[in-house]
């Protein structure tokens, strides 16, 4: 297993609709034809997998059904979008990239993107 550098933004603020997008960029040492991207969430020293996708020479990532992620790729960049976020989902979202083929296998893990999610305030009752 060889190491690879992965860059991602330090902080992202989710929209009022609970959507957060960020770019995960990896320094590919060669021309990989099969890449696996995994988003991990770290909170309270626990790490859980949010979503994962394997892609090949295309620009749309396909996730498992009911995934909260969508994504596209362009060159060595992956544009990830996480939806349905609530305040309790605030945490560090880490991008893990694996170059699956051809050998050798490369693995890179980003430093994480702190995603802040603020639940929208309910609209106050109106007399109008």
């Amino acid at each position: 297993c060889k190491a690879m550098h992965v860059a991602q933004p330090a902080v992202v603020l989710a929209s009022s609709r609970g959507i957060a997008s960020f770019v995960c960029e990896y320094a590919s040492p060669g021309k990989a034809t099969e890449v696996r991207v995994t988003v991990l969430r770290q909170a309270d020293s626990q790490v859980t997998e949010v979503c994962a996708a394997t892609y090949m020479m295309g620009n749309e990532l396909t996730f498992l059904d009911d995934s909260i992620c969508t994504g596209t790729s362009s060159g060595n960049q992956v544009n990830l979008t996480i939806q349905g976020l609530r305040a309790m989902d605030t945490g560090l979202y880490i991008c893990k990239v694996e170059l699956m083929y051809p050998p050798p296998y490369y693995l890179g893990i980003g430093n994480g993107t702190q995603i802040y999610v603020i639940d929208p305030e309910p609209c106050p009752d109106s007399d109008f």
Partner: antibody, heavy 115, light 106 residues
Framework: QVQLVQSGAEVKKPGASVKVSCKAS????????INWVRQAPGQGLEWMGR????????YYNEMFTGRVTLTRDTSTSTAYIELSSLRSEDTAVYFC????????WGQGTMVTVSS | DIQLTQSPSFLSASVGDRVTITCSAS?????IHWYQQKPGKAPKLLIY???TLASGVPSRFSGSGSGTEFTLTISSLQPEDFATYYC?????????FGQGTKLEIK
């Protein structure tokens, strides 16, 4: 030019298995997904699964869980789909198609399941 | 699974007509892709990533939309355009196709 050549038509009895091949040429075999799609007579398209020829990574349509197996032989640039426990409703044309965009398709293989 | 519903399922039109086929997704998708199939033949990629024409596809074909609503438009029907059209999503597994729209000569 890219070519996907599939094996010939098959007639099987219910409960049997069938294995269809898709031989690829004209491109780097390990660079693109190989998808399998079937089409029952007069019906629409149904995605069955895909395989990454390099690593062998597979994704299946859960509708076929346990009945479909996708494999590949990189030495001959050939992909295979095997469907077991055949029933009459599996009668269809089976296509292989390469790439994220299903850019190129095989000519199709007619599989008839009949007692 | 993401369901794709095409409308109409059948469409009768004449050469020179402008026709629009709609594809509605049960859940938001990143892109929709369109295929054309003629009887006894394999499908052919027509439009990918919602609006990009595949190689060799005439400019009378166009695609648009986002989220859950997408359209395929043929600006001026030609005799060779009479076929069945399918939309497809690959945002989540399983990849799914619409039920198809059969375009017939009026």
């Amino acid at each position: 030019q890219v070519q996907l050549v599939q094996s010939g038509a098959e007639v099987k009895k219910p409960g049997a298995s069938v294995k269809v091949s898709c031989k690829a040429s004209g491109y780097t075999f390990t660079s693109y997904w190989i998808n399998w799609v079937r089409q029952a007579p007069g019906q629409g398209l149904e995605w069955m699964g895909r395989i990454a020829p390099g690593s062998g990574t597979t994704y299946y349509n859960e509708m076929f869980t346990g009945r479909v197996t996708l494999t590949r032989d990189t030495s001959t640039s050939t992909a295979y789909i095997e469907l077991s426990s055949l029933r009459s409703e599996d009668t269809a044309v089976y296509f292989c198609a390469i790439g994220d965009y299903f850019d190129y398709w095989g000519q199709g293989t007619m599989v008839t399941v009949s007692s | 699974d993401i369901q794709l519903t095409q409308s109409p399922s059948f469409l009768s039109a004449s050469v020179g007509d402008r026709v629009t086929i709609t594809c509605s997704a049960s859940k938001s998708v990143s892109y929709i892709h369109w295929y054309q199939q003629k009887p006894g033949k394999a499908p052919k990629l027509l439009i990918y990533d919602t609006s990009t024409l595949a190689s060799g596809v005439p400019s009378r074909f166009s695609g648009s939309g986002s989220g859950t609503e997408f359209t395929l438009t043929i600006s001026s029907l030609q005799p060779e355009d009479f076929a069945t059209y399918y939309c497809q999503q690959r945002t989540t597994y399983p990849l799914t196709f619409g039920q198809g729209t059969k375009l017939e000569i009026k």
